[in-house]
């Protein structure tokens, strides 16, 4: 369960892939599209508001113990819009919604490297936001060896 309804912190950052392609958001036909693209040298990067939430993780052992805490994030590139996991379509979409946000908008934050993060679907453990054909998609990671695969690694930058 997520501890409290307010985030423990918020962080405004640009999001890029492991290979330094930018994640951009464009309004098209009254809905937002998400792109993975190379930006021109001085082109401004889109920013995303990451809201960090604490989530208690139930103990694997018997009883009601709590084994540890996880960090969940929501990602909002513009007011009232959040990234959502569409597990049926294996897609990542931007949806307009009100708080409290649905579980599909929450992602468990992983650090696979000191300067890279990954986003695991709260609603579908083992499924991560990744890059496929210059778009964001949901990618199933079936073993810990594949957790470091480049297409699920992202960089956060304040600039």
């Amino acid at each position: 369960s997520i501890t409290g309804i307010s985030p423990i912190t918020e962080y405004l950052a640009s999001l890029s892939t492991y290979n330094d392609q930018s994640i951009t958001f464009a309004l098209e036909d009254e809905s937002y599209e998400i792109y993975v693209e190379d930006l021109k040298k001085d082109e401004k990067k889109d920013k995303v508001l990451l809201s960090y939430y604490e989530s208690q993780h139930p103990s694997n052992e018997s009883g009601d113990g709590v084994d540890g805490k996880m960090l969940m994030v929501t990602l909002s590139p513009t007011k009232d819009f959040w990234l959502h996991a569409n597990n049926k379509e294996h897609s990542v979409e931007l949806h307009k919604c009100e708080k409290p946000l649905p579980d599909q908008a929450f992602f468990v934050l992983h650090n696979m490297h000191s300067n890279c993060v990954s986003f695991e679907c709260k609603t579908d453990p083992g499924v991560f936001i990744g890059v496929k054909d210059n778009h964001l998609a949901l990618i199933k990671v079936d073993s810990s060896e594949n957790l470091c695969t480049e297409n699920i690694l992202f960089k956060l930058s304040e600039t």
């Epitope: 950052a13 540890g68 960090l71 468990v108 934050l109 992983h110 650090n111 696979m112 000191s114 304040e158």
Partner: antibody, heavy 122, light 107 residues
Framework: EVQLVESGGGLVQPGGSLRLSCAAS????????MTWIRQAPGKGLEWIAS????????YYPDSVKGRFTISRDDAKSSLYLQMNSLRAEDTAVYYC???????????????WGQGTLVTVSS | DIQMTQSPSSLSASVGDRVTITCLAS??????LAWYQQKPGKSPKLLIY???RLQDGVPSRFSGSGSGTDFTLTISSLQPEDFATYFC?????????FGGGTKVEIK
């Protein structure tokens, strides 16, 4: 209850080697980044090495890079620090620490071992 | 590397005093800033993380604030058990770095 117990410290000559161990219990070891931090006598804290929860990434400051190696054995819930080419300035209490959250580095170090003293002297 | 400059390096205070310790970073970063308390011969104890979040079990007289480059630890009413050394630590960028410490002594 989370417990971290270091061992392996002692007196070693300059240029020598030592292997520190940290036995972890009370939590799911393989879900956490683990870190070694040291403190020279009467001095401040210095980060020495970190390892990702998967074991796939290791990180060091320049002061120990190439001399120290952090590793983990998830089956034994143990963390290690192999220290080679030891110098007098490596003399310190070495602490094993655990990250605050599953899977990532955010939020400081809520759990520390009692520390093990490494003395490098001839 | 991000340098963390802590001030003052030491201070004398009385029980009941309000105490403020500051940590200045050489460059701005997200708020992955922690504060620790250490007593002689003991391991450090996490007090505050995420710049302002109180670690479980830590008395509410401790509080943290700040963002960017300036961070503050405040003890609202100093208690006898609070006489110790305090360290800040940034976790945003590797190498992880600590402040030099602030020793809080009895006046």
């Amino acid at each position: 209850e989370v417990q971290l117990v270091e061992s392996g410290g002692g007196l070693v000559q300059p240029g020598g080697s030592l292997r520190l161990s940290c036995a972890a219990s009370g939590f799911t070891f393989n879900n956490y980044w683990m870190t070694w931090i040291r403190q020279a006598p009467g001095k401040g804290l210095e980060w020495i090495a970190s390892i990702t929860y998967t074991g796939g990434g290791t990180y060091y400051p320049d002061s120990v890079k190439g001399r120290f190696t952090i590793s983990r054995d998830d089956a034994k819930s143990s963390l290690y620090l192999q220290m080679n080419s030891l110098r007098a300035e490596d003399t310190a209490v070495y602490y094993c620490t655990r990250a605050n959250y599953y899977y990532n580095t955010y939020g400081g170090f809520p759990y520390w071992g009692q520390g093990t003293l490494v003395t490098v002297s001839s | 590397d991000i340098q963390m400059t802590q001030s003052p390096s030491s201070l004398s205070a009385s029980v009941g005093d309000r105490v403020t310790i500051t940590c200045l970073a050489s460059e701005g970063f997200s708020n992955d800033l922690a504060w620790y308390q250490q007593k002689p011969g003991k391991s450090p104890k996490l007090l505050i993380y995420a710049a302002s979040r109180l670690q479980d079990g830590v008395p509410s007289r401790f509080s943290g604030s700040g963002s960017g480059t300036d961070f503050t630890l405040t003890i609202s009413s100093l208690q006898p058990e609070d006489f110790a050394t305090y360290f800040c630590q940034q976790g945003s960028k590797y190498p992880l770095t600590f402040g030099g410490g602030t020793k809080v002594e009895i006046k």
